[in-house]
């Protein structure tokens, strides 16, 4: 639900800044938060036909 802060950025705002270590980018509000606050898609069972998705979380390496 990329609302609030994201909506205020405007369509032409720059790409999000990488997060500091131990934080992840919350796509839904467009800012960095503790990774544990976000819930990722359920993992695919072994042998699933579709490729594993890129994570929406973008922790700083």
């Amino acid at each position: 639900m990329r609302r609030g802060p994201r909506s205020l950025r405007g369509r032409d705002a720059p790409a999000p800044t990488p997060c500091v270590p131990a934080e992840c980018f919350d796509l839904l509000v467009a800012h960095c938060v503790a990774c544990g606050l976000l819930r990722t898609p359920r993992p695919k069972p072994a042998g699933a036909s579709s490729p594993a998705p890129r994570t929406a979380l973008q922790p700083q390496e």
């Epitope: 796509l27 606050l37 976000l38 819930r39 898609p41 929406a56």
Partner: antibody, heavy 117, light 111 residues
Framework: EVQLQESGPSLVKPSQTLSLTCSVT????????WNWIRKFPGNKLEFMGY???????YYNPSLKSRISITRDTSKNQYYLQLNSVTTEDTATYYC???????????WGQGTTLTVSA | DIVLTQSPVSLAVSLGQRATISCRAS??????????MHWYQQKPGQPPKLLIY???DLESGIPARFSGSGSGTDFTLTINPVETDDVAIYYC?????????FGGGTKLEIK
Amino acid sequence: EVQLQESGPSLVKPSQTLSLTCSVTGDSITRGYWNWIRKFPGNKLEFMGYINYSGTTYYNPSLKSRISITRDTSKNQYYLQLNSVTTEDTATYYCATPHTYGAMDYWGQGTTLTVSA
Amino acid sequence: DIVLTQSPVSLAVSLGQRATISCRASESVDDYGISFMHWYQQKPGQPPKLLIYRASDLESGIPARFSGSGSGTDFTLTINPVETDDVAIYYCQQTSKDPWTFGGGTKLEIK
């Protein structure tokens, strides 16, 4: 596995306030996003709003003057309050939670509300 | 608000054949290189069930008969082959812009 369960009245009179509860098990409402969605007769789905991990709320502008979403983290429940209901609010109300892309992968079974005098 | 227009409103497909449902958005739902478009199946008396997220990623536990494609404003859900259990209403949903919106639904029946 996350489980959600809606509870509340099945009949409300026009002009009254609707109050619904979503009870969550299998995860804490202090992480993620916690939504209310409704489905009208005729099959239209409407996103109503959410409360997230920080307690931040978002409301669909079509409802903004009438809606409130709150939570009680000690009970792991969140709530919908809709004021001044009319017959147009007759619908099935769902609570649901999305993952990081906003796709809602866990839903409650829904509770059917009729607004009638 | 982003308006999602689904077509057809209903379709009847023979068992074992392909069903194709289209969803067109009134503006792009892409951001950060991701298409924020998702597909759901809903049967009577049940909540919607997530099938596809991010336009083409198959949700865990969903049969590979379901697939999604598209980007920007034009998206497609394909069911191939169609089975009896697929009779339902299918919805697209965008989570790119506030407020999130759903398509009007496509009712799938068996011919």
